[in-house]
Interface confidence: low
């Protein structure tokens, strides 16, 4: 037997760990797959990405809906030939998440 | 040339992306290296772990100080021979972070 308060605390923690969009730090260059002579300052931006736990090992926390948000960043080319340019960079922002099977099951597999 | 307001927004975002302790969802069983016949409910807990960006590619965001916090969880053994037990589980909680070289440099290496 467990007292109701302890169960409440455990349940609240569990709710907070579940698969949902979470603010995450994303490296812009690797996100956009930019060439090595182009880099961004700041190199990282904050966006929401799916994260957290699923109830079963066979499930993975994945995005079900995505929006793209624009971040103003300095795009710097090496060698530096002009003043660093302020550019709008579109980064994926997960707006919905769900625990889904790690690999989709095909009827003929 | 950039207007001062844009710079402020970019700088604030950069501050928020930097290496610091962030609330993270951690899987208890893999954290504790428990045997496959023991699992926990909830399977995950929220703790602070170092995360975020460093200014240089050669640096990695690592913990410089750690505390251990106790979480009340149900420990379940398979096959189920008794009532799930409420046990205190100690999980590492990063309290300080720093951008450090990816591999420590030894004077004799």
């Amino acid at each position: 037997f467990y007292d109701i308060e302890t169960l409440k605390v455990i349940d609240e923690e569990w709710q907070r760990t579940q698969c949902s969009p979470r603010e995450t730090c994303v490296e812009v260059a690797s996100e956009l797959g930019k060439s090595t002579n182009t880099f961004f300052k700041p190199p990282c931006v904050n966006v929401f990405r799916c994260g957290g736990c699923c109830n079963e090992e066979s499930l993975i926390c994945m995005n079900t809906s995505t929006s793209y948000i624009s971040k103003q960043l300095f795009e710097i080319s090496v060698p530096l030939t002009s003043v660093p340019e302020l550019v709008p960079v579109k980064v994926a922002n997960h707006t919905g998440c769900k625990c889904l099977p790690t690999a989709p099951r095909h009827p003929y597999s | 040339f950039y207007d001062i307001e844009t710079l402020k927004v970019i700088d604030e975002e950069w501050q928020r992306t930097q290496c610091s302790p962030r609330e993270t969802c951690v899987e208890v069983a893999s954290e504790l290296g428990k045997s496959t016949n023991t699992f926990f409910k909830p399977p995950c807990v929220n703790v602070f772990r170092c995360g975020g960006c460093c200014n240089e590619e050669s640096l990695i965001c690592m913990n410089t100080s750690t505390s251990y916090i106790s979480k009340q969880l149900f420990e379940i053994s398979v096959p189920l021979t008794s009532v799930p037990e409420l046990v205190p589980v100690k999980v590492a909680n990063h309290t300080g972070c720093k951008c450090l070289p990816t591999a420590p440099r030894h004077p004799y290496s």
Epitope: K41, P42, F74, L80, S82, V83, P84, E85, L86, V87 | F1, Y2, D3, I4, T6, L7, I10, D11, W14
Partner: antibody
Framework: QVTLKESGPGILQPSQTLSLTCSFS??????????VGWIRQPSGKGLEWLAN???????YYNPVLRSRLTISKDTSNNQVFLKISIVDTADTATYYC?????????WGQGTLVTVSA | DVVMTQTPLSLPVSLGDQASISCRSS???????????LHWYLQKPGQSPKLLIY???NRFSGVPDRFSGSGSGTDFTLKISRVEAEDLGVYFC?????????FGGGTKLEIE
Amino acid sequence: QVTLKESGPGILQPSQTLSLTCSFSGFSLSTYGMGVGWIRQPSGKGLEWLANIWWNDDKYYNPVLRSRLTISKDTSNNQVFLKISIVDTADTATYYCVQVTNPFVFWGQGTLVTVSA
Amino acid sequence: DVVMTQTPLSLPVSLGDQASISCRSSQSLVHNNGNTYLHWYLQKPGQSPKLLIYKVTNRFSGVPDRFSGSGSGTDFTLKISRVEAEDLGVYFCSQSTHVPWTFGGGTKLEIE
């Protein structure tokens, strides 16, 4: 509130090196995208942009004067320096320090430099 | 370099009159990001220049609405609808689209 203040030698002779200091407050040169620059104005004439230095230590110079200009910064002490080598009477002007944003909003009060034999 | 040509060199006006200053650039000031970085400054005797209008038409904070900017491409105009005593001084146009950033030669607004 942003303030910038220039200081210089006042008078110097032809062929000497002019050293100017800009001391600023209200912002930091370690902030992304921030820059500080120098503009000069001969008495009763127009304005000429000389150079600026960015938060990441990149420097930009007016191509016409590039070979004679050196800009540097001391971020921790909120200072930017400009050196002009081999000065001539044509370098007599009021020298302004500016915060490089788009456009120039904050200017120093200016320091008058006279090159005279 | 982009040459900025201001006319007239001197503009005598009576208080309450309208004043108009022209600024022409030797090449288009439209940046590849779509903005036109043409600005206007006023310099009073013994002072540093103060920003009036930025990006062609935008009044800087605290600038009275009697000041207005217009134009596009290479031709720009600053208008003062009713000149007041505090408006006297030298007006400069400036471009920050192309490096090096350049200024016009100035227009002196004075009482006739």
